[in-house]
């Protein structure tokens, strides 16, 4: 019962986490204009992974997609890649974990297969969460660096009187959504891995019973038979886990380009 609860909760937490990662990736507010001490601004700039937007005090908002792919900073491309890998791994993990749920019966699927799938999905969720956290953290680091650079030359004087105010950017809502979502996916993954241990049937620890028949002493170990049929944690099963994780890591997904003006 505790295993089912742990697995179910892990699934739900991961589901929320992956939904959050998707939301964060799509959000436009990865970086928002720093308002200093002024909460009301006539022109408010904010940027996402896919487009940058400007909201005017008139209520008019204009967003422009990043039409170029090669002209974008490498860091931004890296963040995009990390978030997409996180989403892809998370989505596959969710798909795998649905079939792995103890409460769902699919044909004559053995508990060991469910345990394998639970572990596979758990690892996928962990990697997915780490990808999201890494992506958001890389972007945040980029923002901090740029913030202090633009603070250093906040006002660049032009001919004494004329000034050019540089726009500084600070953390947007998407970063916090991404961090929380990545954390939830990670926690969900750990819970799935914990549940896997409970799902895999342990070898029954019966004492050997000896039957003495005409001088021959033969010991029957029920656990031994069980292990040989692939129900326990043998090397063949281990290979499945490793192979499964490796296959998912190699999945590459490229974003379809949605540019809005």
């Amino acid at each position: 019962m505790a295993v089912t609860a742990c697995q179910g909760l892990g699934f739900v937490v991961s589901l929320i986490g992956i939904a959050g990662i998707i939301a964060a990736t799509c959000m436009d507010q990865w970086s928002t204009q720093d308002l200093y001490n002024n909460p009301v601004t006539a022109v408010f700039n904010y940027q996402g992974l896919w487009r940058s937007c400007v909201r005017e005090s008139s209520g008019f908002t204009e967003c422009r997609g990043y039409f170029t792919l090669l002209g974008l900073p490498a860091m931004l491309q890296a963040v995009r890649a990390l978030m997409i890998v996180g989403i892809v791994l998370g989505a596959i993990g969710l798909l795998v974990s649905i079939f792995a749920l103890k409460c769902i019966r699919i044909g004559s699927m053995e508990d060991s297969a469910k345990a394998n799938m639970t572990l596979t999905s758990g690892i996928m969720f962990i990697v997915s969460g780490l990808c999201a956290i890494a992506g958001v953290s890389v972007f945040a680091n980029m923002l901090v660096t740029n913030f202090w650079m633009s603070t250093a030359n906040m006002y660049t004087g032009m001919g004494g009187m004329v000034q050019t105010v540089q726009t500084r950017y600070t953390f947007g809502a998407a970063l916090f959504v991404g961090w929380v979502a990545g954390g939830l996916t990670l926690i969900g993954g750990v819970m799935m891995c914990i549940a896997c241990r409970g799902l895999a049937p342990e070898e029954t620890n019966y004492k050997a019973v000896s039957y003495h028949a005409s001088g021959h002493s033969v010991a029957y170990k029920p656990g031994g038979f069980k292990a040989s049929t692939g129900f326990g944690s043998n090397t063949k099963n281990k290979k499945i886990y490793d192979g499964g994780a490796r296959t998912e890591d190699e999945v590459q997904s490229y974003p379809s380009k949605h540019d809005y003006v």
């Epitope: 204009q33 002024n38 909460p39 009301v40 601004t41 006539a42 022109v43 700039n45 904010y46 940027q47 940058s52 937007c53 400007v54 005017e56 005090s57 008139s58 209520g59 008019f60 204009e62 422009r64 004329v162 000034q163 050019t164 105010v165 540089q166 726009t167």
Partner: antibody, heavy 115, light 113 residues
């Protein structure tokens, strides 16, 4: 079609108060008050977000003037306190548009501060 | 606050003339986010409310004749009337629409020669 109609102007003594109204019909996200002293140029007074009620003022009017709105009546207000002779002007309400331009203006209401 | 300086303060011109009014801001009105300059031009006739002509420094408001055009970026802006018409004799104002408080230029009065 947006229509703006100001009212509430008139003669007031120095140190007195006056509340200007601007009846708004049509979509407005944010509104402004702009004034023009006789024979002088335009002077921006205040701005308000019609949805949140968030205001901002020109430095000369902070503390003396209050911009507000009444959602139910779809009306914009400018409460003017501690009026001075130099506050004598035609007061316009105007709607903010694309590029923060003011595309629709009221006909203006004259405020005269004199003893 | 951003100061707006218009020149000339007044000018005399004839119908059909090409008229240029300049406006200078104390700070750049160019927004890095969308590469647009937040400068607005208005026309005001005596006893009337101002009329929006141009926003984003060069975008013509709907219904405004094409003889009006705006240009400029950063701190220097220009309003041009390619061929002055009788109805164009009025006072023209530029406005900082980039940051609060919004500020207007002192105005340029276009009179008949």
């Amino acid at each position: 079609e947006v229509q703006l109609v100001e009212s509430g102007g008139g003669l007031v003594q120095p140190g007195g108060s006056l509340r200007l109204s601007c009846a708004v019909s049509g979509y407005t996200f944010s509104m402004n008050w702009v004034r023009q002293a006789p024979g002088k140029g335009l002077e921006w007074v205040a701005w308000i977000n019609m949805y949140t009620g968030e205001p901002t003022y020109a430095d000369d009017f902070k503390g003396r003037f209050t911009i507000s709105r009444d959602d139910s009546k779809n009306t914009l207000y400018l409460q003017m306190n501690s009026l001075r002779a130099e506050d004598t002007a035609v007061y316009y309400c105007a709607r903010s548009s694309k590029g923060n331009g003011l595309d629709y203006w009221g006909q203006g209401t004259l405020v005269t501060v004199s003893s | 606050d951003i100061q707006m300086t218009q020149s000339p303060s007044s000018l005399s011109a004839s119908v059909g003339d090409r008229v240029t009014i300049t406006c200078k801001s104390s700070q750049s009105l160019l927004n890095s986010g969308n590469q647009k300059s937040y400068l607005t031009w208005y026309q005001q006739k005596p006893g009337k409310a101002p009329k929006l002509l141009i926003y984003w420094a060069s975008t013509l408001e709907s219904g405004v004749p094409s003889r009006f055009s705006g240009s400029g970026s950063g701190t220097d802006y220009t309003l041009t009337i390619s061929s002055l018409q009788p109805e164009d004799f009025a006072t023209y104002y530029c406005q900082n629409a980039y940051s609060f408080p919004f500020t207007f230029g002192q105005g340029t009065k276009v009179e008949i020669k």
